[in-house]
C-alpha cells in the first residue's frame, strides 16, 4: 500500500529573469527513492537517479541547475515558463508518487511565494 | 574521445571473465558509462551504468547477479565483470559514454566478442 | 519494464525517398527517448535524442519527434550510406529498453 505523500512549493510566483527553485518532498513512507523525474507538461525537465546523478534535457541545459537536494533550480525564467510542473517520484517498493507544482512567472516585481500544500 | 575495449574472450561455461574500457580524450570522471550487450543478429541490451566520479551504478535487473561494473580513474579505465557464464552471455559487449549531465549513449567502443563455450 | 515497439523490422526505400519509422512506448516517457544508427559490422552510433535534437555531426536529413508514448524518426532523402539498422532507445526510468530495431534496406 503507498502511504507517502509529496510535498510541494506549492502555487508559486517569480520575476521575468530571475530563478526559481522547484522542490518536492516525499514524507510518511519509508520506500527507497529510485529516481525522480521532473517534467514540464510534455516535456522532460530533468532526471536525478539515485545512483548515476543527475540527467538535464538539452531544451534546458542552459538554464536548469540540478538541486537542491532533489530539487531543480530554473534560472533566466521567461514568461513561456509559466505553467504546471511536476515530480514524479519513483520508488520501490511502493511505485510511483507525483507532486504538482504551478509557476507563474510575472513581468513586475510582485512575485510572492505561495504556501506549501500537500499531495496524497 | 575514444573508447578502447579489450580484446575477443573465449571462455568456458561456469567460468568469468572482466572486461575493460580504457577512456581517452576527456575527463573520465565528467561522463557515466554505461555497458550494452547485443546478442549476434540481434537488438541491443541495457546491461548497466557507472559514475565514476563516485562509483555509483545502476543496473538492469536482469543483469544485476550477472554483471559488477567498476573502475579505475587512475587509468580512466571501466571494468565489467560477467560471471557464472552460460551460452546466452555469448556476445558483443560494448561500452558507450554519456553526454554531459546525459544519459544518452554518445561514444561507443568497438565491443568485445564474449564466445562461452566448452 | 518500458516496451519500445518499432512495428516494422525492415523497411525497403529507393534513394532519395522520405522515409520514417515509428516507435511506440508502452507507457508515458515524456521526451527521453533516443534514436542510434547501427551499420553492418559497427558499432551504434547516437544520431537523435530528446527526441529531437541531432547529436554533433549528424547531418540534416535525419530528424525526429514525438513525446509521451509514440515517436517517429524520419529521413528526409534517403542515401545509399543509410542501409543500417535504427533502434530508439528510453531512458525514462530504468530498465533503460531499446526497440528490437528497424533494418532500413537500400532498393
Known amino acids: 500500500m503507498m502511504t507517502g505523500t509529496i510535498e510541494t512549493t506549492g502555487n508559486i510566483s517569480a520575476e521575468k529573469g530571475g530563478s526559481i527553485i522547484l522542490q518536492c518532498h516525499l514524507s510518511s513512507t519509508t520506500a527507497q527513492v529510485t529516481q525522480v523525474n521532473w517534467e514540464q507538461q510534455d516535456q522532460l525537465l530533468a532526471i536525478c537517479n539515485a545512483d548515476l546523478g543527475w540527467h538535464i534535457s538539452p531544451s534546458f541545459k542552459d538554464r536548469v541547475a540540478p538541486g537542491p537536494g532533489l530539487g531543480l533550480t530554473l534560472q533566466s525564467l521567461t514568461v513561456n515558463d509559466t505553467g504546471e510542473y511536476f515530480c514524479i517520484y519513483h520508488t520501490y517498493p511502493d511505485g510511483t508518487y507525483t507532486g504538482r507544482i504551478f509557476l507563474e512567472v510575472l513581468e513586475s516585481s510582485v512575485a510572492e511565494h505561495g504556501a506549501r500544500f500537500q499531495i496524497p | 574521445v575514444q573508447l578502447q575495449e579489450s580484446g575477443a574472450e573465449l571462455v568456458k561455461p561456469g567460468a568469468s571473465v572482466k572486461l575493460s574500457c580504457r577512456a581517452s580524450g576527456y575527463t573520465f570522471t565528467d561522463y557515466f558509462v554505461y555497458w550494452v550487450k547485443q546478442r549476434p543478429g540481434q537488438g541491443l541490451e541495457w546491461i548497466g551504468g557507472?559514475?565514476?566520479?563516485?562509483?555509483?551504478?545502476t543496473f538492469n535487473e536482469k543483469f544485476k547477479n550477472k554483471a559488477t561494473l567498476t573502475v579505475d580513474t587512475s587509468s580512466s579505465t571501466a571494468y565489467m565483470q560477467l560471471s557464472s557464464l552460460t551460452s546466452e552471455d555469448s556476445a558483443i559487449y560494448y561500452c558507450?559514454?554519456?553526454?554531459?549531465?546525459?544519459?544518452?549513449?554518445?561514444?561507443w567502443g568497438q565491443g568485445t566478442l564474449v564466445t562461452v563455450s566448452a | 519494464d518500458i516496451v519500445m515497439t518499432q512495428s516494422h523490422k525492415f523497411i525497403s526505400t529507393s534513394v532519395g525517398d522520405r522515409v520514417s519509422i515509428t516507435c511506440k512506448a508502452s507507457q508515458h516517457v515524456s521526451t527521453a527517448v533516443v534514436w542510434y544508427q547501427q551499420k553492418p559490422g559497427q558499432s551504434p552510433k547516437l544520431l537523435i535524442y530528446s527526441p529531437s535534437y541531432r547529436y554533433t555531426g549528424v547531418p540534416d536529413r535525419f530528424t525526429g519527434s514525438g513525446s509521451g508514448t509514440d515517436f517517429t524518426f524520419t529521413i528526409s532523402s534517403v542515401q545509399a550510406e543509410d542501409l543500417a539498422v535504427y533502434y530508439c532507445q528510453q531512458h525514462y526510468i530504468t530498465p533503460w529498453t531499446f526497440g528490437g530495431g528497424t533494418k532500413l534496406e537500400i532498393k
Open positions: 557507472i559514475n565514476p566520479s563516485n562509483g555509483g551504478a
Open positions: 558507450t559514454r554519456g553526454n554531459f549531465y546525459g544519459y544518452e549513449f554518445a561514444y
